[in-house]
């Protein structure tokens, strides 16, 4: 039995943060349990991860790199992505794991969120201004 | 809950060679890493060398470069510290860590479970 994760199909992060929620087809409340993101198509970079249980407060871990948040729902972990560089526009995934109670469960991988990071755009100030009026 | 379980410490003449291993049990995901940190006598505990799951991912101390290697066995949960050319500085407690992250930390606190530690001493 898996575990159903379902995701935004695409994100845009126009002000270099972005919140990615993953909605679960189970109830997390009362679950051990370690949510993590992934970036790439092989999901070869785990950037954060949630660790949950029930007799702790949420754990929240971030890779060099990235700077990441975390919050908990029933049934959903909302990653909360901060100082994202134009560089790391990519596909994101979604995996659970549930340790405890038994059965240990995993999910299904999801389709991913494409997390397409915008790059701040200042306009420039003139290089010659013109005279400034009274 | 994860219990870490450390050996392999001892006493070394300087230049000599140590492996430390630090077991664990309980409740594994299928990522997480694990390291190596040590505190010296009124020193702060400090990172020496962490792997991740899939052992693709390992960074170590610039103090202990090529001198110490982190290595694993998942089949046995098991991290080892391969230490040489062994100094006076090395003398400290060894502590193994276990973290839900899955990459190699060096960062303390990303640490939720630590060994009882073994010591280690470099004398001629």
């Known amino acids: 039995n898996k575990i159903l994760v379902k995701q935004s199909p695409m994100l845009v992060a126009y002000d270099n943060a972005v919140n990615l929620s993953c909605k679960y087809s189970y109830n997390l409340f009362s679950r051990e349990f370690r949510a993590s993101l992934h970036k790439g198509l092989d999901s070869a970079v785990e950037v954060c991860v949630v660790y949950g249980n029930y007799s702790q407060q949420l754990q929240v871990y971030s890779k060099t790199g990235f700077n990441c948040d975390g919050k908990l729902g029933n049934e959903s972990v909302t990653f909360y992505l901060q100082n994202l560089y134009v560089n790391q526009t990519d596909i994101y995934f979604c995996k659970i794991e549930v340790m405890y109670p038994p059965p240990y469960l995993d999910n299904e991988k999801s389709n991913g969120t494409i997390i397409h990071v915008k790059g701040k755009h200042l306009c420039p100030s003139p290089l010659f201004p013109g005279p400034s009026k009274p | 809950e994860v219990q870490l379980v450390e050996s392999g410490g001892g006493e070394v003449q300087p230049g000599g060679s140590l492996r430390l291993s630090c077991a664990a049990s309980g409740r594994m995901f299928s990522n997480y890493a694990m390291g190596w940190f040590r505190q010296a006598p009124g020193k702060e505990r400090e990172f020496v060398a962490a792997?991740?799951?899939?052992?693709?991912?390992?960074d170590y101390a610039e103090s202990v470069k090529g001198r110490f290697t982190i290595s694993r066995d998942n089949a046995k949960n098991t991290v080892y510290l391969q230490m040489s050319s062994l100094r006076a500085e090395d003398t400290a407690v060894y502590y193994c860590?276990?973290?839900?992250?899955?990459?190699?930390?060096?960062?303390?606190?990303?640490?939720?479970?630590w060994g009882q530690g073994t010591l280690v001493t470099v004398k001629p």
């Open positions: 860590g276990f973290t839900y992250a899955g990459w190699a930390s060096s960062g303390r606190d990303d640490y939720n479970y």
């Open positions: 792997i991740n799951y899939r052992r693709d991912d390992a």
